[in-house]
Amino acid sequence: IVLRPSRVHNSEENTMRALTLKDILNGTFSYKTFFPNWISGQEYLHQSADNNIVLYNIETGQSYTILSNRTMKSVNASNYGLSPDRQFVYLESDYSKLWRYSYTATYYIYDLSNGEFVRGNELPRPIQYLCWSPVGSKLAYVYQNNIYLKQRPGDPPFQITFNGRENKIFNGIPDWVYEEEMLATKYALWWSPNGKFLAYAEFNDTDIPVIAYSYYGDEQYPRTINIPYPKAGAKNPVVRIFIIDTTYPAYVGPQEVPVPAMIASSDYYFSWLTWVTDERVCLQWLKRVQNVSVLSICDFREDWQTWDCPKTQEHIEESRTGWAGGFFVSTPVFSYDAISYYKIFSDKDGYKHIHYIKDTVENAIQITSGKWEAINIFRVTQDSLFYSSNEFEEYPGRRNIYRISIGSYPPSKKCVTCHLRKERCQYYTASFSDYAKYYALVCYGPGIPISTLHDGRTDQEIKILEENKELENALKNIQLPKEEIKKLEVDEITLWYKMILPPQFDRSKKYPLLIQVYGGPCSQSVRSVFAVNWISYLASKEGMVIALVDGRGTAFQGDKLLYAVYRKLGVYEVEDQITAVRKFIEMGFIDEKRIAIWGWSYGGYVSSLALASGTGLFKCGIAVAPVSSWEYYASVYTERFMGLPTKDDNLEHYKNSTVMARAEYFRNVDYLLIHGTADDNVHFQNSAQIAKALVNAQVDFQAMWYSDQNHGLSGLSTNHLYTHMTHFLKQCFSLSD
């Protein structure tokens, strides 16, 4: 199926041009999305082109400036947050990135009723996290690893925790591993629905081994960055959850929430917290061996001022074929009775589906079913449940939004998006206002992305929020590559692939092939989304065919494919890339002497192993920031899929699956190894060990490091990286510069 047909016709050829590397590096063909910042059922905020913060009322159709660009500029604000009572706005400036989600910033509070900044009891700086209560204008913030509370912005703060200490005790914010691998947020505190209580996590990293690396900067001596980072098998953070009454915070102080006995008996993780009501909270816990998860519903006991988590309100989710959940264990979406909930987990056929849990997980009512997967529950209202899935036309790389009417019996299902803009839009997400009165749909492709506003009752489109007209016009004279998404059936395994073909593709000719791989557990590369990126350029200008293949271990096609890699990372992911390459060669248009593979992060690991597979298929390849041994990567991620690196568990496969173990096999390929020296995630250690093994085996290879760059290799490093990789591939494929 050709998703993005080239617009080239003979008469137009003279005016059309190919993509250039400069186009990609300059972001010339980047697209915009529009996510409303909902503040009620019918109102949202949005930052206008001229940087005013504007309120839009859907019902009246009118806009209102609530914060002028001058006010924003007066403190160099790059972000804002409106208090729910609409009395104040916080303005965020001096953004300073830390890890993937975390950053520190300076915060100013602006009073909307008098148009002035709040003076007196100003916030300290820099703050690690700050948020309004869900009702009113209480403030909770984290400063120097401790949590503070303000009843009103101008009030003096009440200090909730006192034991916070850099790299030791984290209150209300996650440590490195919880941020990256468990919570996927910069915060670890949660207000109850009406702001009566504040729950927070405390992470104790005292006994965690520290990763240390040099940050060269421009001083005479480099700095050393120290991060408590538990690698596979190492000591993990100790987590505790506390809840404090924010109305009378000094009365009884923070109360600890008990951990379920079956969890507390060995090493465990806290995975998420969901408030149900002001006096009911749901916590999710996970054993260190991540195939058992417990969802615990706890109630506030007024008489004792404590939180009680009865065993009858513990729901166990266990996997016998892999790990619990997909990438993460799914979170519950509670219904209006405040005890039953909807949750995505594997059905008896091994497909992730929505279930309704009223009393026990064993008695769960399955809401969706089929050989496809429910991916996200967006919203549950009194009469509807909105979710996304890849059911439509059996393409796993699509996302459509569905509505199930739960108010009627039997419940009826309607695809909201399937036929809206069928050619242009096959991959959606959604953003809902209060009570799903309205919602925005954001379509990511395969055509040019478009964001639209819809009535939550009738699903009628109200207006286009962003249609990327400028992008559409800019692309009119560009020879875009063709894209097709198809599947290969090999030994009872379905391998979906995306192929990106040069604009004047001719099946009778031979083309160099580049495989782009990620391949990590529960990932998906073959998606029906729009992108004009480096590989688009390689196809458009350099005449390469690029292929992405979703093999075993990838997501949204059932547990058989997903859990196939359980406890044996680095085997089937590589095999499936190789199998796909052989199938591509059989198609007749691939020059089998010019095949390359490249990947980043997990993809760097897979590309390295593929190059060292000894098949002779690959002429060259690139690994950017690769994992080289699972013993070097984070405990939470690695052990989820690999178990522990101990003799009585899975040490043997930890050792067998390293890149270093295959150093000899790199002798007959051209290998380019790239890594940032300040990579906090996949440590430079990984590439250092590959390089050492290659040197020890006297194998020639090319390498590039990026000083003081992290896992993202951003800024000027990006330009250098893609320029360098382009030269390497052109040389490998004997393409003239």
Epitope: T65, I66, S68, L112
Partner: antibody
Amino acid sequence: EVQLLESGGGLVQPGGSLRLSCAASGYTLTDYNMDWVRQAPGKGLEWVGDIYPNTGGTIYNQKFKGRFTISRDNSKNTLYLQMNSLRAEDTAVYYCTRFRGIHYAMDYWGQGTTVTVSS
Amino acid sequence: DIQMTQSPSSLSASVGDRVTITCRASESVDNYGLSFINWFQQKPGKAPKLLIYGTSNRGSGVPSRFSGSGSGTDFTLTISSLQPEDFATYFCQQSNEVPYTFGGGTKVEIK
């Protein structure tokens, strides 16, 4: 100090037209929406409509739609109300107000200008 | 349109009295936890002045003796201790739905 000063009121015959002006000072016009409200002699207050000065987007009380038009000139920091096909019942004091959108509140009012529709 | 009914239409009170004016909307004006009910004070020959916005928030420079409360359809303006300068007409107004509508007014007179 925020000040709103209406002008342009007067006596007009039924069926006639009138254009009211409102000069805003003490703040930037584009920072707030502007509304017109009228008050008939001895009667209550009646909302006419609202304008978003940045784009000129307007909303009206359905009762006045088609006859009354709100516009603005940002360079002059001035708001206008064009009234056509005037009737005797349009006789009132017309106030221009600054509308604080986040609170849906008219926080500053002009002193008003009187419009009399009579033959 | 939402009708706003004020009561009483007039009242007589003395300086120092506690005065309560009520306003009833023909339908709920709750907007997801907020009610866009505003109160204005108008003196003869003058423009109205914003006293209370969003049900209970005092406007700029408004004395603390003025307070507002209510939700749904029923709202109240309270003057805790009437002062000589408070003798005026008071209007409630809803901004929850277009057209924005005003109550008929309550005239507070000297007893």
